[in-house]
């Protein structure tokens, strides 16, 4: 009955502050409408980073001002979070909800620890 959600344990953001990871869910049924939410857990506090609802076979659409982008393929969602800084290092949890058709299922991943290292400022150069 429970829906399993898998995501990588650790991801390192690149020098531009972008981190990508795959969120994969084992669907107990044939869902046509899915909602994916990225949550950040820090000091036992959970906050929403971004969310998107999509129809199976269609693209994920995040809000225009979202720091997330993503694509879906079957039961896999490829998520990218942009604009990260060192202070954003933390555990990012993928939550998947099968909204339609019934029954509703919710699945929560164990979280991906994203490490963000702010780039060193470039030294002044005479060239």
């Amino acid at each position: 009955k429970a829906m399993h959600v898998a995501q990588p344990a650790v991801v390192l953001a690149n020098s531009r502050g972008t981190a990508s990871f795959v969120c994969e869910y084992a669907s107990p049924g044939k869902a046509t409408e899915v909602r994916v939410t990225v949550l950040r857990q820090a000091d036992s506090q959970v906050t929403e980073v971004c969310a998107a609802t999509y129809m199976m076979g269609n693209e994920l659409t995040f809000l225009d001002d979202s720091i997330c982008t993503g694509t879906s393929s079957g039961n896999q969602v490829n998520l990218t979070i942009q604009g990260l800084r060192a202070m954003d290092t933390g555990l990012y949890i993928c939550k998947v909800e099968l909204m339609y058709p019934p029954p509703y299922y919710m699945g929560i991943g164990n979280g991906t620890q994203i490490y963000v290292i702010d780039p060193e400022p470039c030294p002044d150069s005479d060239f």
Partner: antibody, heavy 118, light 108 residues
Framework: EVQLVESGGGLVQPGGSLRLSCAAS????????MHWVRQAPGKGLEWVSF????????YYADSVKGRFTISRDNSKNTLYLQMNSLRAEDTAVYYC???????????WGQGTLVTVSS | AIQLTQSPSSLSASVGDRVTITCRAS???????LAWYLQKPGQSPQLLIY???SRATGIPARFSGSGSGTEFTLTISSLQSEDFAVYYC?????????FGQGTKVEIK
């Protein structure tokens, strides 16, 4: 501070109708799914209905299916439960509850009492 | 629907006692999707434990949850006077959302 305040309960005759409201404040209402849960006098908790973020997806307990309708108005931060064809066994305190990020019902209203009796 | 059965249905205990309540599910429930609530007379239910183990904000450390699969446990390590109430387990992983029938903790 998160607050959920129910209203609309009261005494109604069998076969009658009632509309419950739940006014939400202190959080971004449209970012959360919501539920109605009821508790008959001296009994346990019974889940009644669920509504998705945008109101497009709704689920009901078998005991109320076809008689109750859940809805929401995100512009007014309000959740509703339209109850038709009421029966004596629908007598209960009705609570609205917010779904927390990780699934459980993290905030509950104070409840509103619905009494179905002739 | 997943049925949840709590045991015992009621118990009498004294302040300082260790209390254990069990919740058995009719089918597999992932530990991420099992919650516990407490309800004091005349009040709304209050979230105690979510994800089988995690304490909700502001819940004292004397409350702890454990278990997996189909059997889950709520433990109060040292019962306080304010803990006399009714306790419910709930599964929130799939519809229909279901609650246990409740366990009433009374003063001995």
């Amino acid at each position: 501070e998160v607050q959920l305040v129910e209203s609309g309960g009261g005494l109604v005759q069998p076969g009658g109708s009632l509309r419950l409201s739940c006014a939400a404040s202190g959080f971004t209402f449209s970012h959360y799914t919501m539920h109605w849960v009821r508790q008959a006098p001296g009994k346990g908790l019974e889940w009644v209905s669920f509504i998705s973020y945008d109101g497009n997806n709704k689920y009901y307990a078998d005991s109320v299916k076809g008689r109750f309708t859940i809805s929401r108005d995100n512009s007014k931060n309000t959740l509703y439960l339209q109850m038709n064809s009421l029966r004596a066994e629908d007598t209960a305190v009705y609570y609205c509850a917010r779904t927390g990020w990780l699934g459980p019902f993290d905030y509950w209203g104070q409840g509103t009492l619905v009494t179905v009796s002739s | 629907a997943i049925q949840l059965t709590q045991s015992p249905s009621s118990l009498s205990a004294s302040v300082g006692d260790r209390v254990t309540i069990t919740c058995r599910a009719s089918q597999y429930v992932g530990s991420s999707y099992l919650a516990w609530y407490l309800q004091k007379p005349g009040q709304s239910p209050q979230l105690l434990i979510y994800g089988a183990f995690s304490r909700a904000t502001g819940i004292p450390a004397r409350f702890s949850g454990s278990g997996s699969g189909t059997e889950f446990t709520l433990t109060i390590s040292s019962l306080q006077s304010e803990d006399f109430a009714v306790y419910y387990c709930q599964q929130d992983g799939s519809s229909p959302w279901t609650f246990g029938q409740g366990t009433k903790v009374e003063i001995k």
